[in-house]
Amino acid sequence: MDSSAGPGNISDCSDPLAPASCSPAPGSWLNLSHVDGNQSDPCGPNRTGLGGSHSLCPQTGSPSMVTAITIMALYSIVCVVGLFGNFLVMYVIVRYTKMKTATNIYIFNLALADALATSTLPFQSVNYLMGTWPFGNILCKIVISIDYYNMFTSIFTLCTMSVDRYIAVCHPVKALDFRTPRNAKIVNVCNWILSSAIGLPVMFMATTKYRQGSIDCTLTFSHPTWYWENLLKICVFIFAFIMPVLIITVCYGLMILRLKSVRMLSGSKEKDRNLRRITRMVLVVVAVFIVCWTPIHIYVIIKALITIPETTFQTVSWHFCIALGYTNSCLNPVLYAFLDENFKRCFREFCIPTSSTIEQQNSARIRQNTREHPSTANTVDRTNHQLENLEAETAPLP
């Protein structure tokens, strides 16, 4: 901590664990640097925390232009892909499915949380490039809280979807009452309320501080600062990583065990093929979550325990880990929406608005064929549906 930090109840540059979206939120994981190299170290030599601060305290040693461009390119790609993918998912769901099924309600909530999380990246990028927070105190509070809020909401929704699928397979009768649109909405509201447990305190703790010519958007902690700072890190680690990994792994594991245990009297080859596809999907979903979130959580823990010299490699790897966390928000639309058969059907309608008309004409033609040539009805229609049908069981669970 910088010993000149003030009257003792404020920690300007400490970095409680980053937002659950692994984001470099202005007040979160990030420790932004000047690009021009003419900066002093406003945080002082003794600062602690994740990136050096839960503020966007400029780092000692400015990054080279190559480093800056690399980091900005990384953030820009993640931001554009994340916003485009998630807004597209939300639009298609609202426009074409009207939020009528539990699955679509979960996917919409996931896309909303992920879109909001990635929307903080432009602010963090500007902060990184300028080495100061130019957006004012209100936006500082909003951006940091959105970052934490939506990291948690996104992760809680992923957990909810794994529980939902587990219930569908292992408790099919309960699923009839549980998997309703009304219940899905209630569960989503509960997820947002749970996320408030960290989102609201962070909003109150976030503030801007003037430090030697630059402005930091930072979290302030009551004394003893080390206690509150580490408590936040531990909470984020447990509730945004350990617990979700356990829930997702256990739910999908039990689901696959249940499906494996089923004995078929006929169609066992199809069962095996379906099971392989579902297992593959589950492995991808779990692996993507772990790959995206492990690096930043490990990094945060290491930085909390030991002092890491600030080199170019350290800066780039830090920002890469942050970007990986946001990458999870980019991949969620692909894993949960674009691979879902129902969503794909709506998406095709969005891309080719005339498809429903063609389908209606086809079905009219098929009905005509059936009356004239009953034996060919299946063949004719199966050709029309072939592509759609082959995808069905391949979809990762909705």
Epitope: T103, A175, M264, S266, V380, E388, A392
Partner: nanobody, 122 residues
């Protein structure tokens, strides 16, 4: 030969609920679906579900009121119908199809149950 046997139909008041069941004697891994035929109308898609029971699809008219699930261990397909309306009156059929995914077209389904009557009337 796959045999599908539906049960659970009956007379119910508007706004009431009913749960239909369909037992698959062959324990197939085929995708399955529910269809209905109202008097004087074409057979209409209601819902379909993959073998795993994870991925249900619904007709727009019932999506916010009906829920389908599949018990793979007991080879039973369910349809929970809530907030029933007069226009839900129909014979409800359970169907299974060769394993190439879900479909909302009745022509894609190879095996059919005998149907169970659902009447919504005050």
């Amino acid at each position: 030969q796959v045999q599908l046997v539906e049960s659970g139909g009956g007379l119910v008041r508007p706004g009431g609920s009913l749960r239909l069941s369909c037992v698959d004697s062959e324990r197939t891994s085929y995708p399955m679906g529910w269809f209905r035929r109202a008097p004087g109308k074409e057979r209409e898609f209601v819902a379909s579900i993959t073998w795993s029971g994870i991925d249900p699809t619904y007709a727009d008219s019932v999506a916010d009121r009906f829920t389908t699930s599949r018990d793979v261990a007991n080879n039973t397909l369910y349809l929970q119908m809530n907030s029933l309306k007069h226009e839900d009156t129909a014979v409800y059929y359970c169907a299974a199809r060769a394993p190439v995914g879900q479909s909302s077209s009745p022509y894609d389904y190879d095996y059919w149950g005998q149907g169970t009557q659902v009447t919504v009337s005050s």
